[in-house]
Interface confidence: low
């Protein structure tokens, strides 16, 4: 903190406010009576410079005028934009243990003078809005700058307002506060910034305008629509503007979307039809306006509607599938299963669905509904059986989907060739076929059909499936697909009455299974040991299991074991093998192999045969 | 099932700040609208902001609109709602919810499949 200067006094030449560049000559005078009380001899004055109160610079080899003991002068160079404080100090050279007096400061200010203020904009926000002006300042000038806005128009009309720039706030726009009314539309209005700092001031070019030219009209508001007769795709789109708006922009899209649907309408007067909206839609709604077809600015857009267009009948077919399971000798279980439409083709939300099972013959029919997308029913095994499902919502149903009843894998000569499945990635499974070799008649489509094979799938969940034109033979199916679970895969061939199907095992990922199988029994029948298992839980198998291996050696021996692999099916859990000795010792394992690999050896079992030896 | 856990809550100063996170359980989290609500006592749930097709889209509220940043990290599984220039008003309880994305009703809670269990924001002096 520098006293108040009781000491001496500092000035500057040729002022404290220098342009970038220049030098300054900084004097610092002690009053009469001050000083060192020795004698004035030893009076030494010294010149410290600081930037953000920091001490930077020593000045002493600086001097370029020295009255001893009175008064010193300075030259000071290179100072950087901005602000400089500079204090002078006395020092008594003969008393080195007292510190150097603060005499008195200056600050000095390096700036530049103001650019001329370039690329004046005015606006005008509504009819009853007032003017406001932006500029472009120019480069920095470091200084308090002084900037005057002036408009001049028709009638004398003139009006001014100032704002200053500084190191805390920055002035490039002034609100006028006078609004221009349309009865001005064709006069012409001039604004100019005028700006001055220390080091000199400025005036942009003059900036010509009409009253159209600033006017931006408020965004239209109180945004409405109306559904003609409940429609779902048609609707009427109201709003408020103000008096003058001759033409407006609408756009809209669904909430979905990312591109905008767009209208011009001219003399709108607040109202438009919309013809092309999709039924059951959440949609959002903007609008803008102008006061003049080819001149003026658009307004900011309005705030959004969003509201949902109504329902409408579904369109589109529901894709059904089914599954027949023969109950006894005259008795048939029948399940449908139907994929739900999607949005557009739903149109609403899906009430219920209509399911007709009829025998074509005997003109038998079944008929339900049902909200879920699966429907069983028992039936006789005798007849020609289709079916039918259609989709319902609040306006209506969906023209019904048939599909003829046929035994799916019932003709052989139907199923598909060469089918095999090889795993994409993580979530996908690509199957490829070859078309039957042998059909009778022509096949109208491929079913994909897939179900994870765990334990009560086939009860507990629905299949997924996938529809193939006749002339593709290859699906990838990603639907419900997760790495390390084996999937049964059935590719169905349909003509017109009957199906025929071939059936494969395949995975998305795999790894070696985390366990072997577990033996629970070994039993001896007719000199041949039946090795009995339980199969590795599903969890652990961690893909399509491939086959398994019996190993066995004799207890106590050091040699390889012997092993026997079986082809892996899920119905079996038993195998013979007949090249053991008779009353000698064997230990017994299995291990499960997958295409990643094998797993590590299940339980150990000991057994002695006590038959013949082959 | 998608299991979600919101963090990042706590008391705050009006004109302060506070992130909140939103982590999923599961990988089928870019195939999903994740969506922020808030509750304040003896109010409804009332919708905060969304962010739709692994970020591409947003909406906010009005009432939030300038202040609240929401975002997405698909590679983490994690939804964030970054709010500044927080007002008293603002004091609820912020839930995380996410929906298979229809396009139907964003800011209706009944269209959103799973949520998480809620972090309490207060501001207050």
């Known amino acids: 903190n520098i006293d108040v200067c009781k000491l001496g006094t500092v000035t500057v030449q040729p002022a404290p406010v220098i342009p970038l560049g220049s030098a300054a000559n900084i004097s610092c005078s002690l009053n009469p009576k001050q000083g060192c009380s020795h004698y004035p001899s030893s009076n030494e004055l010294i010149l410290l410079k600081f930037v953000n109160d920091v001490l930077v610079e020593n000045l002493h080899g600086k001097k370029v005028h020295d009255h001893t003991g009175h008064s010193s002068t300075f030259q000071v160079t290179n100072l950087s934009l901005g602000m400089t404080l500079f204090v002078c100090k006395l020092n008594c050279s003969n008393s080195q243990k007292k510190p150097p007096v603060p005499v008195c400061g200056v600050e000095i200010s390096v700036g530049v003078a103001p650019e001329p203020p370039q690329n004046i904009s005015c606006v005008q926000e509504g009819e009853n809005g007032t003017v406001a002006c932006s500029w472009n300042s120019g480069k920095v000038t470091y200084l308090k700058t002084n900037y005057t806005l002036q408009l001049s128009g028709p009638n004398n009309l003139t009006c001014q307002k100032q704002c200053f720039s500084d190191n805390r706030q920055n002035c490039n726009r002034l609100d006028l506060g006078i609004n221009l009314s349309p009865d001005l539309a064709e006069s012409r209005f001039i604004v100019r910034v005028t700006a001055i700092n220390d080091l000199g001031n400025s005036s942009s070019l003059p900036h010509t305008f009409t009253f159209l030219d600033i006017v931006i009209p408020l965004p239209p508001w109180d945004i409405r629509i109306n559904f003609l007769n409940a429609s779902g795709s048609r609707g009427t789109l109201q709003w408020e503007d103000e008096g003058q708006v001759v033409l407006n922009q609408l756009r809209y899209q669904p909430l979905n979307s990312t591109s905008w649907n767009m209208v011009n309408a001219t003399n709108a007067k607040g109202k438009y039809d919309l013809r092309d909206l999709r039924p059951f839609t959440e949609y959002e709604f903007q609008i803008s306006s102008k006061l003049h077809l080819s001149g003026g600015s658009w307004s900011n857009w309005s705030e959004s509607l969003r509201t949902r267009t109504p329902e409408e009948e579904p369109v589109g077919i529901l894709d059904i599938w089914y599954m027949k399971q023969d109950i006894d000798y005259d008795r048939q279980q029948i399940s449908l299963f139907w994929k739900s439409l999607n949005p557009s083709e739903a149109r609403g939300k899906i009430l219920h669905y209509q399911v007709t099972l009829q025998e074509v013959t005997k003109k038998t029919t079944l008929q339900n509904t049902t909200r879920h997308t699966s429907w069983t029913r028992v039936i006789p095994r005798t007849g020609a059986w289709t079916a039918s499902v259609s989709a319902a919502n609040s306006k209506g149903a969906s023209a019904p989907t048939h599909i003829n009843i046929v035994d799916l894998c019932g003709t052989g000569l139907l199923a598909p060739h060469q089918v095999s499945a090889k795993s994409e990635n993580m979530d996908n499974i690509l199957v490829t076929w070859q078309p039957p070799k042998k059909a009778d008649s022509a096949v109208r489509e491929y079913i994909v059909e897939w179900r994870a094979l765990q334990p009560g799938s086939i009860t507990k969940f629905p299949p997924h499936w996938l529809r193939i034109p006749p002339d593709n033979m290859s699906a990838l199916i990603s639907e419900n697909i997760k790495p390390y679970i084996c999937y049964e895969i059935r590719v169905h061939a349909l003509s017109e009455s009957q199906g025929g199907c071939s059936s494969i095992r395949g995975d998305s990922k795999h790894k070696a299974p985390v366990s072997g199988p577990h033996i629970t029994a070994i039993t001896e029948k007719k000199e041949r040991l039946f090795i009995s298992w339980t199969h590795i839980p599903f969890p652990e198998q961690r893909g399509c299991i491939l086959h398994y291996r019996i190993y066995w050696k004799e207890r106590d021996s050091t040699a390889q074991p012997e092993l026997c692999e079986i082809q892996y099916r899920r119905s079996q859990n038993s195998h013979p093998i007949s090249s053991l000795q008779p009353r000698v010792t064997y230990v017994l394992w299995m291990t499960a192999v997958t295409a990643a690999g094998e797993s590590p050896q299940g339980n150990e079992r000991e057994f002695c045969p006590q038959g013949k030896a082959n | 099932q998608v299991q979600l856990q919101e963090s990042g809550g706590g008391l705050v100063q009006p004109g302060g700040s506070l992130r909140l996170s939103c982590a999923a359980s599961r990988r089928t989290f870019s195939k999903h609208a994740m969506a922020w609500f808030r509750q304040a006592p003896g109010k409804e749930r009332e919708f905060v902001a969304v962010v739709r097709w692994s970020g591409i889209i947003t909406y906010y509220a009005d009432s939030v609109k300038g202040r609240f940043t929401i975002s997405r990290d698909d590679a983490k599984n994690t939804v964030y709602l970054q709010m500044d220039s927080l007002k008293p008003e603002d004091t609820a309880v912020y839930y995380c919810?996410?929906?298979?994305?229809?396009?139907?009703?964003?800011?209706?809670?009944?269209?959103?499949?799973?949520w998480g269990q809620g972090t309490q924001v207060t501001v207050s002096s």
């Open positions: 919810a996410a929906g298979d994305y229809r396009g139907n009703g964003y800011y209706v809670p009944g269209m959103y499949d799973y």
